[in-house]
Interface confidence: medium
């Protein structure tokens, strides 16, 4: 049968009518219900939040909805010895204490089980020291303290401002400087926007509000205890001394409230630029410790937090596909939050169910997609994107046959100004194809297509006339299906001005204040931001799941294999004596990539000739295009990061939520100029080119006739 | 730390060319995967982008301004510099030299130079 045939709608009405039945003010009203009370992984509000939403999923017309168990590393605070920090003075006695709890907005005074701002999988300890402001404690900011400035942070507290890199990255550079434990907190600089109220007046943080989060460096593994394999019944557990990711010293997170307190009276040497003052009144001081009068008083931490084996649950929904039931196209957001998780994650939780409840309705007008649509309301994201991980290692040998796309849905807005899409290369023609079919939401675009506006706000630094869509990282559940599994993935939501706007995520990201009412007061009052990303989210996995040939163009590819190339090998070329003393050549890499390039091409070409009518054909045509983004898995996995095996994408050791294209290569040639072996390493920049230049032919000849 | 620094006169007359420098340092013009972008504020309103040259020379301009604009580089100074031509009062705005890239995390802006556009 072909496709028309069996879903009884022609395509072009069957998306339309999906797309219409997309409300606005039942995203509003869905956010609205999953936001009344927190929903923390491993509690039984979220447990009863899944039930809640497998029945929905069930009345609005799913195949079946079940729930997927696992029990895996949660961490949580004691609740009768809450973690601080103090300012001690030669006595030890407590001369200031943070914060134990971030007051409640108003309406929620009196709701219980708001978790206290603490910083998950920290281990317990009461370390005391001198405190070192190392900034944001990226990479470059421990260069710029060890080896320029003579800084050492062995045996110290270090205190760094979020913002520009991965929590855990941070946490993870402090270790390696030798510090033993670490403050978190939010300079008003990077969370506070000139000229917007502080909340609940406005959707700026207030000095008393508290990012929560988790600082593992799991790289892709899931849960700690099981890497690999999923956390089932019967699972063999690590011991906690073996356990993936874990962090090793103290670490807690504070509001600038506190964060003056501790900053305002630092000495030692001056911030080294303007780069590394934010917007308190302190000085910003580096340290090590007090400034003189203050000389003999310390800093201490004190952390009690557990790591606990606790069940979490996947909601997980089928909408069996007509033609091809054994091809799956995945959308998938996680459930669990911090607190109420008005933004993460229920914006898009909210979507999700929308988007669920379109697709039932035309399921029930007899209407089925040609493949089959799984949604998934993930648990314990928040913890290390547990939940999807767990569950994609459960079902890697399905997933690894069939997935055809994984769509995320996490929070939907992080701004009101434009679209933000990261994606494979194979989706930017469907994401472009798709977004000039849709109306944009947009003051001063009334009339214009989203991709208009978008274009507009936010232009591609290539190509003109195009919107920007940046490379895929991490920090969020696609990770498991696009670095492990190389399965297509792609995100989209709406942003905020970043050309404009300094600040880090959205000044209430993980805190107290992320409210319902933080998104109807001050975000999107009408839901129509939601909306257009619903229509973006739901109208990609409507295309991918029910276009008679896959809306995947190859050739996408190709373009950024030749900029991702060139960019790595200018990158080596700032070393061209060592290039030359170890005969480092890239002709390989260029090589492979000059031949997928004529490769796709010619692809291309007998895409659009092939007889579409004949079944076995299409179905071949369309599994070369499924199986390419397989194409560029390693089996081997990337240097001391097995689950990480795309060899074109992987989230940059530096900030595990930014992609790094040729992350073997780069990696290799990261501060090469340290090395204590400069032969060693130089081998491995060839190794890496080697394996890169391997992967992309391999992937060229999936294209290539298969006979 | 990368710091862009844009110079030239802030003052032109209309149908002169406008121009403009964009002196780039901690760090050198060209570095891989880069874009070195010009875009401009008009008073009161939001920001337009003007044109960008990659790091492998290759140009991009906004096609509203396509006709008057050259973007150009000189490495061995590490600067970078916009020439506007037939310039009228609808120029006057706020310019700003900024490094783009691939992800959003690579967007740096200089201080800005306001432009005036007046006989």
């Known amino acids: 049968k072909s496709s028309n045939e069996a879903t009884n709608i022609t395509p072009k009405h069957n998306m339309k009518a999906f797309l219409d039945e997309l409300k606005a003010e039942n995203i509003k009203k869905f956010l609205y219900n999953f936001t009344q009370i927190p929903h923390l992984a491993g509690t039984e509000q979220n447990f009863q939040l899944a039930k809640q939403i497998q029945s929905q999923w069930k009345e609005f017309g799913l195949d079946s909805v079940e729930l997927a168990h696992y029990d895996v590393l949660l961490s949580y605070p004691n609740k009768t010895h809450p973690n601080y920090i103090s300012i001690i003075n030669e006595d030890g006695n407590e001369i200031f204490n943070t914060s134990l709890f971030e007051p409640p907005p108003p309406g929620y005074e009196n709701v219980s089980d708001i978790v206290p701002p603490f910083s998950a999988f920290s281990p317990q300890g009461m370390p005391e020291g001198d405190l070192v402001y190392v900034n944001y404690a990226r990479t470059e900011d421990f260069f710029k303290l060890e080896r320029d400035m003579k800084i050492n942070c062995s045996g110290k507290i270090v205190i760094a401002r979020y913002g520009k890199v991965f929590r855990g990255n941070k946490v993870k550079n402090a270790q390696l400087a030798g510090a033993k434990g670490v403050i978190l907190y939010s300079d008003p600089a990077d969370y506070f926007a000139p000229g917007v109220k502080s909340y609940p007046d406005g959707w700026n943080l207030p000095g008393g509000g508290v990012q929560r989060g988790n600082i593992l460096n799991l790289n892709g593994a899931g849960d700690p205890l099981t890497p690999g394999y999923p956390a089932n019944e019967y699972a063999y557990r690590r011991g906690i001394a073996e356990a993936v990711g874990l962090p090793s010293i103290p670490v807690h997170p504070i509001g600038y409230y506190d964060a003056q307190k501790l900053l305002e009276k630092m000495g030692g040497s001056a911030p080294p630029d303007s780069s590394w003052r934010g917007s308190l009144k302190v000085p910003y001081n580096v340290g090590p410790g007090f400034t003189g009068n203050f000389s003999t008083q310390k800093v201490k931490m004190h952390i009690h937090s557990t790591n606990e084996v606790t069940r979490i649950y996947n909601v997980i929904g089928t909408l069996r596909g007509a033609v091809e039931p054994d091809r799956y196209v995945i959308l998938g957001g996680h459930r669990d939050s911090w607190v109420f998780g008005g933004i993460d994650p229920q914006s898009g939780a909210a979507v999700v169910h929308e988007i669920v409840r379109s697709f039932g309705t035309l399921k029930k007008e007899g209407w089925r997609p040609r493949r089959t649509i799984l949604f998934a309301s993930w648990d314990a994201e928040e913890f290390g994107l547990l939940g999807s991980t767990e569950w994609a290692e459960e079902n890697s040998r399905l997933l690894q046959e069939r997935g055809v796309a994984y769509i995320n849905a996490d929070s939907s807005i992080e701004g009101n100004y434009t679209l933000r899409v990261d994606c494979t290369p194979l989706m930017y023609s469907l994401v472009h194809n798709l977004t000039k079919e849709l109306k944009s939401p947009d003051e001063g675009f009334e009339g214009k297509s989203l991709y208009e506006s978008w274009t507009k706000k936010s232009p591609s630094p290539e190509f003109s006339g195009m919107p920007r869509i940046s490379k895929l990282g991490s920090g969020n559940d696609f990770e498991v299906f696009f670095q492990r599994l190389g399965i297509a993935s792609g995100r989209a939501r709406y942003t905020k001005n970043w050309e404009t706007n300094k600040f880090s995520g959205y000044p209430l990201y993980h805190s107290v204040y992320e409210t319902y009412e933080l998104v109807e007061k001050f975000y999107d009052p009408m839901f129509k931001y939601h909306l257009t990303v619903a229509q973006v989210r739901g109208g990609m996995v409507f295309e991918l799941a029910n276009s008679i040939v896959l809306p995947f163009d190859c050739r996408d590819y190709a373009v950024v294999l030749r900029k991702y190339a060139d960019k790595i090998y200018s990158i080596s070329m700032k070393h061209p004596q060592e290039m030359k003393t170890y005969s480092v050549s890239f002709d390989s890499l260029f090589s492979a990539v000059k031949n997928f390039t004529e490769i796709a091409s010619k692809f291309s070409e007998r895409l659009q000739d092939f007889d579409k009518s004949n079944p076995i054909v299409l179905r071949m045509m369309n599994d070369q295009l499924m199986f390419l983004e397989r194409a560029f898995i390693d089996p081997l996995g990337l240097p001391d990061r097995p689950f990480y095996r795309h060899v074109i994408y992987a989230p940059s050791s530096h900030n595990k939520y930014a992609g790094e294209s040729f992350p073997g290569i780069y990696d290799a040639l990261f501060d090469i100029e340290s090395k204590v072996d400069p032969s060693k390493a130089w081998g491995e920049v060839k190794r890496q080119i080697y394996v890169a230049a391997f992967t992309v032919q391999a992937a060229a000849e999936t294209l290539s006739e298969v006979a | 730390q990368v710091q862009l620094q844009e110079s030239g006169p802030g003052l032109v007359k209309p149908s002169q060319t406008l121009s403009l420098t964009c002196t780039v340092s901690?760090?050198?013009?060209?570095?891989?995967?880069?874009?070195w972008s010009w875009v401009r504020q008009h008073p009161g309103k939001g920001l337009e982008w003007i044109g960008f040259?990659?790091?492998?020379?290759?140009?991009h301009y906004n096609p509203s301004l396509k006709s008057r604009v050259t973007i150009s580089v000189d490495t061995s100074k590490n600067q970078f510099s916009l020439k506007l031509n037939s310039v009228t009062a609808a120029d006057t705005a706020v310019y700003y030299c900024?490094?783009?890239?691939?992800?959003?995390?690579?967007?740096?802006r200089g201080q800005g130079t306001l432009v005036t556009v007046s006989s």
């Open positions: 900024a490094r783009d890239g691939d992800d959003y995390g690579d967007y740096l």
């Open positions: 901690g760090g050198s013009i060209s570095n891989s995967g880069y874009y």
């Open positions: 040259i990659y790091y492998n020379g290759s140009i």
